[in-house]
Interface confidence: medium
C-alpha cells in the first residue's frame, strides 16, 4: 500500500536535484580558484541536512548554518549587484562586467539558482511530487528560507556603493514583498553602505518616462533614506544598448543616454 504523502501546492523537487547540486558545485570550484578548497561532497551533505527528514513548513535559517559555513565566500563588498524581478539582465550584466557580482555569481547562489527542493518529516526521502508554495502553503519552506538566508548574508556583506537592477515594466517597480524589498533592503549596513544606486530598466522601445519618479521608487528612497543610506536612481531606457556599451564603452554611440 503506497504511503500517504502530503500534497503541497507548489512544484516538487527539481529532477536529479542531488546530482545537479553536486555537478554545479564541482563546476563552480573548477572555474573559481579561490573556492578550490571546497569539498563538494561535504557541501551536498550540509545542503541535504538542512531539509531532509524535516517538516517542509518548519525550516529555519539555523538549519542552513552548516551549509553557510562551508560556502563562506568573500566577494568584493563594493561590487555587489542586487536585482528584483529582472534576473536575466542582471546576470547578463555581470557576465560582461566581470568584476561585479550578483548573489547567483557566488557558490551558494549558483548551486540553488532556479531549483526547487523539499523533504518530508521523519523520512529521508526527497519529495519530487510537490513542495510548499510560499503563499498558499507556508513561508518557512526549504527554498524560501534558503534564499532569505543567503540574501540576508549577501546584503550584510555589501559596502560602499551597492547597485540594484529593477524591472520598470512591472506595476510595482519596487515591491516591498520581493526578496530585495523584504530582506536585502533591510540588511544593508548603513555603517558600510554609502549609497544604493537603483537602475530602473525600461521595457518598451518608445518608453521615455522618468520611472525614477514612480511612487514605488519614492517609497524605496524613503525606506533607504530612513536607514541613513544615500539613494540614487537612473533610468536605463535601452537595456540592449546598455549591455552593448558595457561590452564596448569606447563605442561612439555610448556617450548618449541609454
Amino acid at each position: 500500500v503506497p504511503r500517504w504523502r502530503q500534497q503541497w501546492s507548489g512544484p516538487g523537487t527539481t529532477k536529479r536535484f542531488p546530482e545537479t547540486v553536486l555537478a554545479r558545485c564541482v563546476k563552480y570550484t573548477e572555474i573559481h580558484p579561490e573556492m578550490r578548497h571546497v569539498d563538494c561532497q561535504s557541501v551536498w551533505d550540509a545542503f541535504k541536512g538542512a531539509f531532509i527528514s524535516k517538516h517542509p513548513c518548519n525550516i529555519t535559517e539555523e538549519d542552513y548554518q552548516p551549509l553557510m559555513k562551508l560556502g563562506t565566500q568573500t566577494v568584493p563588498c563594493n561590487k555587489i549587484l542586487l536585482w528584483s524581478r529582472i534576473k536575466d539582465l542582471a546576470h547578463q550584466f555581470t557576465q560582461v562586467q566581470r568584476d561585479m557580482f550578483t548573489l547567483e555569481d557566488t557558490l551558494l547562489g549558483y548551486l540553488a539558482d532556479d531549483l526547487t527542493w523539499c523533504g518530508e518529516f521523519n523520512t529521508s526521502k526527497i519529495n519530487y511530487q510537490s513542495c510548499p508554495d510560499w503563499r498558499k502553503d507556508c513561508s518557512n519552506n526549504p527554498v524560501s528560507v534558503f534564499w532569505k538566508t543567503v540574501s540576508r548574508r549577501f546584503a550584510e556583506a555589501a559596502c560602499d556603493v551597492v547597485h540594484v537592477m529593477l524591472n520598470g515594466s512591472r506595476s510595482k517597480i519596487f515591491d516591498k514583498n520581493s526578496t530585495f524589498g523584504s530582506v536585502e533592503v533591510h540588511n544593508l549596513q548603513p555603517e558600510k553602505v554609502q549609497t544604493l544606486e537603483a537602475w530602473v530598466i525600461h521595457g518598451g522601445r518608445e518608453d521615455s518616462r522618468d520611472l525614477c519618479q514612480d511612487p514605488t521608487i519614492k517609497e524605496l528612497e524613503s525606506i533607504i533614506s530612513k536607514r541613513n543610506i544615500q539613494f540614487s536612481c537612473k533610468n536605463i531606457y535601452r537595456p540592449d544598448k546598455f549591455l552593448q556599451c558595457v561590452k564596448n564603452p569606447e563605442d561612439s554611440s555610448c556617450t548618449s543616454e541609454i
Epitope: M100, P190, E197, N228
Partner: antibody, heavy 119, light 111 residues
Framework: QVQLLESGGGLVQPGGSLKLSCVAS????????MNWVRQAPGKGLEWIGK????????NYTPSVKDKFFISRDNAKNTLYLQMTKVRSEDTALYYC????????????WGQGTTLTVSS | EIVMTQSPASLSASLGQRATISCRAS??????????VHWYQQKSGQPPKLLIY???NLESGVPARFSGSGSGTDFTLTIHPVESEDVATYYC?????????FGSGTKLEIK
C-alpha cells in the same frame, strides 16, 4: 527649517584642548550622518570627519586622526568635536555640516565657530 | 586618499560670458552609473552652498545658468551667462569614499 548652530570656539594655546558643539534643529537628527569641515583663514575647505547616526562608525581625515574626536548626543540633538594637542595649523573656522548628497535638498551647513591657536 | 585638483585658481569673466572651472580627481570617483562629485559656491563670510550634486544634477533653487559635467576623473562646472552675483569661490568635492576631499577652490571675479 533646518538649522545647525556651532559654538565653543575661542583662543587656545598650542598643545591645548577644546570641545566644539553643534546643535541641530528642524530635522530628525538621529537619522543622519553628521560631518565637521574646517576652513583656515584665506584657505580652502578641509573635511575633518563624520559620524554615523548611532555613533557606531566614525571616519576621519588622516591629518586629525588620534587628535580630534567626533561624538554626538541624539537626545540633545548635538554633535561634538573634541580637539586635543592643537597646533597653529588648526586655527580655522569650524563648520558642522549635513553632507548628504544623493538626491539633492539634503545639504546643510552651520555658520561656523572659530578656533584660534596662539601662545 | 583621492586628491581633487582644481583649476584655474582664479578666473576673471565678463558679465554674460561663460566661465568654466575644472576639477581632476587622482582616482576615479565614478561608478557604472554615477559620479560622486559635487560643486559648492562660497561667498565671502558665508558657509558653502551646494550648487551641483552627483556631477550634473542642479540642486533645487539654484539658477539654471549653473551646470556640471564629467565622469571618471575629469569634471567641469560651467556658469553661463555669468552674473555679478556669481562672484565667489567655487569648490569641487568628492564623496566616493572616505576621506572626503575638496578641491583647492577657484575664485571668480567679474572683469
Amino acid at each position: 527649517q533646518v538649522q545647525l548652530l556651532e559654538s565653543g570656539g575661542g583662543l587656545v594655546q598650542p598643545g591645548g584642548s577644546l570641545k566644539l558643539s553643534c546643535v541641530a534643529s528642524g530635522f530628525d537628527f538621529s537619522l543622519y550622518w553628521m560631518n565637521w569641515v574646517r576652513q583656515a583663514p584665506g584657505k580652502g575647505l578641509e573635511w575633518i570627519g563624520k559620524i554615523s547616526p548611532d555613533s557606531s562608525s566614525l571616519n576621519y581625515t588622516p591629518s586629525v586622526k588620534d587628535k580630534f574626536f567626533i561624538s554626538r548626543d541624539n537626545a540633545k540633538n548635538t554633535l561634538y568635536l573634541q580637539m586635543t594637542k592643537v597646533r597653529s595649523e588648526d586655527t580655522a573656522l569650524y563648520y558642522c555640516a549635513r553632507l548628504w548628497i544623493a538626491t539633492g535638498g539634503y545639504n546643510y551647513w552651520g555658520q561656523g565657530t572659530t578656533l584660534t591657536v596662539s601662545s | 586618499e583621492i586628491v581633487m585638483t582644481q583649476s584655474p585658481a582664479s578666473l576673471s569673466a565678463s558679465l554674460g560670458q561663460r566661465a568654466t572651472i575644472s576639477c581632476r580627481a587622482s582616482n576615479s570617483v565614478s561608478t557604472s552609473a554615477f559620479s560622486y562629485v559635487h560643486w559648492y559656491q562660497q561667498k565671502s563670510g558665508q558657509p558653502p552652498k551646494l550648487l551641483i550634486y552627483l556631477a550634473s544634477n542642479l540642486e533645487s533653487g539654484v539658477p539654471a545658468r549653473f551646470s556640471g559635467s564629467g565622469s571618471g576623473t575629469d569634471f567641469t562646472l560651467t556658469i553661463h551667462p555669468v552674473e555679478s552675483e556669481d562672484v565667489a569661490t567655487y569648490y569641487c568635492h568628492h564623496s566616493r569614499e572616505v576621506p572626503f576631499t575638496f578641491g583647492s577652490g577657484t575664485k571668480l571675479e567679474i572683469k
